[in-house]
């Protein structure tokens, strides 16, 4: 059976928030997967497709595992968007430096979804968004997405504010 | 607003079971680690464990590994600790905390062990 | 003006989080990653940290201050508390 080939894993940041796109590990390839979370520091994974691997060696690494599927090629619910946007703002608020991991399948649709909406939620232009993303992982969205993302309103609930109340564009280190 | 209501007040014999319970609301149960914590009478906090109730997975303090049991209903988002072989160093407030990093927490159950 | 201090055993980096404990047994966060102020918390609150050293400074005390504070790491498990502090009125 011919293997499929995984793109590698794709960091994106922006102000202060920072996530890893992945592919989909299987059993098999889960040490590796767990070393390459590591490696970028990942503390929290959001898996976005059908489960198709044990979490618990991931969890007993200290990563936190989120189980929110939503449909190949289509958009996420609402309920997954506001899980998503309140989960970013806490994460990063909370654990500064920390990165967020999403991964589909290949990482080319449902994952970089999420990603390209904190990016606009963050006060990126979708365009921008979608570009920017898109330099780091060619093929990234469908027309569908790409449509959703074009009329998706932001409510700009990750303009993140410093310690003494002021908007923050800049990054936290 | 983000809230946790915690079962009453429990008596207990020793060597018998607890289970107490910690309903969330005003969030996604399931985005957020639910933590327990103990507090003997005039004395510090103590972390038992967590549950992730997105995939079940817990975690225990050593301590009380063979002493609580964590689990979680999705649909009801309410978090469960059972106590086990309980004696009198049980008796304590136990709290549930979730929400980011103890963002919030229960106002607690009274675990009294007494024959 | 009072400040409780925490040290830290390892590098636990911003993770950690000052607690307040009232005489009913409420517990509400205060600051969380070491010097960020909780949403509704007054101004007089503030964290910050000096090597391994975290600090909790009330910098004008009100009678409803003194209570009882927890300082609790989240770098990693098992999370930790410290021993805790009763501020009492001298």
């Known amino acids: 059976m011919a293997r499929m080939n995984r793109p590698a894993p794709v960091e994106v940041t922006y102000k202060n928030m920072r996530f890893l796109i992945t592919h989909n590990p299987t059993n098999a390839t889960l040490n590796k997967f767990i070393e390459e979370l590591k490696k970028y520091g990942v503390t929290t994974i959001v898996r976005v497709c059908e489960a198709t691997y044990d979490t618990t060696l991931v969890e007993k690494e200290g990563i936190h595992v989120l189980d929110w599927p939503f449909d190949d090629g289509a958009p996420p619910s609402n309920q997954i968007v506001d899980d998503w946007l309140s989960l970013v703002k806490i994460k990063f608020r909370e654990e500064p430096g920390c990165c967020i991991a999403v991964h589909c399948v290949a990482g080319l649709g449902r994952a970089p979804v999420l990603v390209a909406l904190a990016l606009i939620e963050g006060g990126m232009k979708y365009e921008d968004a979608v570009q920017f993303i898109r330099q780091k992982r060619r093929g990234a969205f469908n027309s569908k997405q790409l449509l959703y993302l074009e009329k998706y309103r932001p409510k700009m609930r990750l303009r993140f504010k410093d310690s003494n109340g002021h908007r923050n564009n800049c990054c936290i280190q | 607003q983000v809230q946790f209501q915690q079962s009453g007040a429990e008596l207990a014999k020793p060597g018998a079971s607890v289970k107490m319970s910690c309903k969330a609301s005003?969030?996604?149960?399931?985005?957020?680690?639910m933590h327990w914590v103990k507090q003997r009478p005039g004395q510090g906090l103590e972390w038992i464990g967590y549950?992730?109730?997105?995939?079940?997975?817990?975690e225990y303090n050593q301590k009380f590994k063979d002493k609580a049991t964590l689990t979680a209903d999705k649909s009801s988002s309410t978090a469960y600790m059972q106590l086990s072989s309980l004696t009198s160093e049980d008796s304590a407030v136990y709290y549930c905390?979730?929400?980011?990093?103890?963002?919030?927490w229960g106002q607690g159950t009274t675990l009294t062990v007494s024959s | 003006r009072v400040s409780l201090t925490c040290r830290a055993s390892?590098?636990?980096?911003?993770?950690l989080n000052w607690l307040q404990q009232k005489a009913d047994g409420t517990i509400k966060r205060l600051i969380y990653?070491?010097?960020s102020l909780d949403s509704g918390v007054p101004k007089r609150f503030s964290g910050s940290r000096s090597g391994s050293d975290y600090s909790l400074t009330i910098s004008s005390l009100e009678s409803e201050d003194f209570v009882d504070y927890y300082c609790?790491?989240?770098?990693?498990?098992?999370?930790?508390f410290g021993g805790g502090t009763k501020l009492e009125i001298k």
């Open positions: 905390s979730s929400y980011g990093n103890f963002g919030y």
């Open positions: 005003g969030y996604t149960f399931t985005s957020y680690r």
């Open positions: 549950i992730n109730p997105s995939t079940g997975y817990t």
């Open positions: 390892q590098d636990i980096g911003s993770s």
């Open positions: 990653a070491t010097s």
């Open positions: 609790l790491q989240y770098a990693s498990s098992p999370w930790t």
